[in-house]
């Protein structure tokens, strides 16, 4: 009779075990073990037992004791059971970023590790375990679906391996893949909101806004706003679940024309989007041209206006006829006409919207000197003693320069206030002195004395 | 009676594939260790792979990633499958029962010719 | 590996002659040493097992010795059929390994 010490045995992959092999009778023809392991016989004192040490065990292998005794040939068997944790756990790739309300699967793939009937798969969000099934197939896979939630953000979900050989009398041996953090996210079906000058002139800035409720989580959206291929920096407020990005836009005359304004929110792995049209024009204002801004009195003036080319004026009041961009009027000029404004509006329509410039220009007539009777009255009577104030107003562009001396050298104190007296009466020469010229009028003073009774 | 009947050889170019077979009768294959031994035209006997009766499997280095020895004990056959053969591996392939450590019983052998 | 090495690589003898073969291991085998025979064109036959157990129905003019590193194959009276390739071979370790053969061939 053949037996075999031990007649079972698990180990470690690649591992040796001592394996006795004895028979029952004192002299045995044969006694030997069967097997492709690589062994190593100890010498023992005795014919009837034999000691191998089998090395580099990697597979699970059955060695068979033989022997001959004169009764019979015998065998038995040992069964070594090698075990090995996993060579690879793996969480299957997902994209970091998950809709809440989306379905996830979430897929462990084990390769290798034995004994198999001892190996166990668990699918785990951060300690709490969501699916346990024993290793089944190589590789082994293990699937579960999660309904991705908002609370899940941030959540660590891996794949444990559980090697259980504590009925063996050995250990439990875990073996544990690279956590997956989901990163949870909530991206509205509204595009956002953009709010943006429709026009937009050249040389000059303009504030775009653009802004999105309802994300989650809000401070991990980024905003993209740009006008055509100038991307802009905008200055990003945010709300619980919303931000309001606003930025200045300054365009040149490169961009002239309709430009795509647009403006992007991405979260995740998904992105919303809206477009908006600019329409960038160029409008200098009107020109209002006078022949010249400083004429004579009598002078033919001609004042013109002249805008855009697409521009439709009115000068003074009075549309060009016909309706375009130029118009013009022509005047003599009289001294009424001197700080005239003349004033040029011109309208252009851009993108449906009517843009108004105005441009004035003020005329100047050199006109005078005058001095008349209204203004400068001939003949004066005054009582004695009495306060008055001498009135004589020269007109004239240049205001002139105005004297009034009796016999050459006395003056008549214009435009102050004196006490009537003798000396006062006479008649003046008053004259008035410009670059235009000069004027000369009389103006008789004359003195009432009282009358003593 | 005891016999193993082999099949399965053939020429085959440089990189190329081959599957040899091996059916046992007369005896309880799945109780016997299995292997394959090889020898070139004129020259002596190789060792090419062995498979246990628990199905662990060993190769020496020359053959190892490249060949696969299996056995379905319902069928009682042995199977041996060449990938991306060389020139030297051409030779006459046997199957053998190992029994009290040694090959007491052997295939008829099957040419194997890897030549382009 | 464990290196089997035969003598003589061939030798030309009569029938009734005492052959003698030997074979030596590059490491201790124990009593694992096998001895086949094999003819052209032919599957090796396993002649000895186990240094020296006679294999089933092989003829007891075969005989085999040894253990540890030299193993001798001893063939007392040569018969005609005996002219072929012998083979010893080790089963203490894997890979298993052959001694590289002698032809026994007739004067």
């Known amino acids: 009779q053949t037996s075999v010490s031990p007649s079972k045995v698990i180990l470690p992959r690649g591992g040796s075990v001592l394996v006795t092999c004895s028979t029952s009778c004192d002299q045995p023809k044969l006694l030997g073990i069967e097997t492709p392991l690589p062994k190593k016989e100890l010498l023992l004192p005795g014919n009837n037992r034999k000691v191998y040490e089998l090395s580099n065990v990697q597979e699970d292998s059955q060695p068979m004791c033989y022997s001959n005794c004169p009764d019979g040939q015998s065998t038995a068997k040992t069964f070594l059971t090698v075990y090995w944790t996993p060579e690879r756990v793996e969480l299957a790739p997902l994209p970091s970023w998950q809709p809440v309300g989306k379905n996830l699967t979430l897929r462990c793939q084990v390769e290798g590790g034995a004994p198999r009937a001892n190996l166990t798969v668990v699918l785990l969000r951060g300690e709490k375990e969501l699916k346990r099934e024993p290793a089944v197939g190589e590789p082994a896979e293990v699937t579960t679906t999660v309904l991705v939630r908002r609370d899940h953000h941030g959540a660590n979900f891996s794949c444990r391996t559980e090697l259980d050989l504590r009925p063996q009398g050995l250990e439990l041996f875990e073996n544990t893949s690279a956590p997956y953090q989901l990163q949870t996210f909530v991206l509205p079906a509204t595009p956002p909101q953009l709010v943006s000058p429709r026009v937009l002139e050249v040389d000059t800035q303009g504030t775009v806004v653009c802004s999105l409720d309802g994300l989650f989580p809000v401070s991990e959206a980024q905003v993209h706003l740009a006008l055509g291929d100038q991307r802009l920096n905008p200055t990003v407020t945010y709300g619980n679940d919303s931000f309001s990005a606003k930025a200045s836009v300054s365009v040149t005359a490169e961009d002239e024309g309709t430009q795509r304004l647009t403006c992007a929110v991405i979260l995740g792995n998904q992105s919303q989007e809206t477009l908006q049209t600019v329409t960038i024009y160029s409008f200098p204002a009107p020109n209002v041209i006078l022949t010249k801004p400083e004429v004579s009195e009598g002078t033919e003036v001609t004042v013109k206006c002249e805008a855009h080319p697409r521009a439709k004026v009115t000068l003074n009041g009075v549309p060009a006829q016909p309706l375009g961009p130029r118009a013009q009027l022509l005047l003599k000029a009289t001294p009424e006409d001197n700080g005239r404004s003349f004033s040029c509006s011109a309208t252009l329509e851009v993108a449906g919207q009517l843009i108004h410039k105005n441009q004035t220009r003020e005329l100047r007539v050199l006109y005078g000197p005058r001095l008349d009777e209204r203004d400068c009255p001939g003949n004066w009577t005054w009582p004695e003693n009495s306060q008055q104030t001498p009135m004589c107003q020269a007109w004239g562009n240049p205001l002139p320069e105005l004297k009034c001396l009796k016999d050459g050298t006395f003056p008549l104190p214009i435009g102050e206030s004196v006490t009537v007296t003798r000396d006062l009466e006479g008649t003046y020469l008053c004259r008035a002195r410009s670059t235009q010229g000069e004027v000369t009028r009389k103006v008789t003073v004359n003195v009432l004395s009282p009358r003593y009774e | 009676q005891v016999q193993l009947v082999q099949s399965g050889g053939g020429l085959v170019q440089p990189g190329g594939s081959l599957r040899l077979s091996c059916a046992a009768s007369g005896f309880t294959f799945s109780s016997y260790d299995m292997h394959w031994v090889r020898q070139a035209t004129g020259k002596g006997l190789e060792w090419v792979s062995a498979i246990g009766t628990a199905g662990d499997t060993y190769y020496p280095g020359s053959v190892k990633g490249r060949f696969t020895i299996s056995r379905d004990n319902a069928k009682n056959s042995l199977y041996l499958q060449m990938n991306s053969l060389r020139a030297e591996d051409t030779a006459v392939y046997y199957c053998?029962?190992?029994?009290?450590?040694?090959?007491?019983?052997w295939g008829q052998g099957t040419m194997v010719t890897v030549s382009s | 590996d464990i290196v089997m090495t035969q003598t003589p690589s061939s030798l030309s003898v009569s029938v009734g002659d005492r052959v003698t073969i030997t074979c030596r291991a590059s490491?201790?085998?124990?009593?694992?040493l096998n001895w086949y025979q094999q003819k052209p064109g032919k599957a090796p036959k396993l002649l000895i097992y186990a240094a020296s157990t006679l294999q089933s129905g092989v003829p007891s003019r075969f005989s085999g010795s040894g253990s540890g590193t030299d193993f001798t194959l001893t063939i007392s009276s040569l018969q005609p059929e005996d002219f072929a390739t012998y083979y010893c071979?080790?089963?203490?370790?894997?890979?298993?390994?052959f001694g590289q053969g002698t032809k026994v061939e007739i004067k």
């Open positions: 053998a029962r190992s029994a009290l450590s040694a090959f007491d019983i």
């Open positions: 071979q080790q089963s203490y370790s894997t890979p298993r390994t």
């Open positions: 490491q201790s085998i124990s009593s694992y």
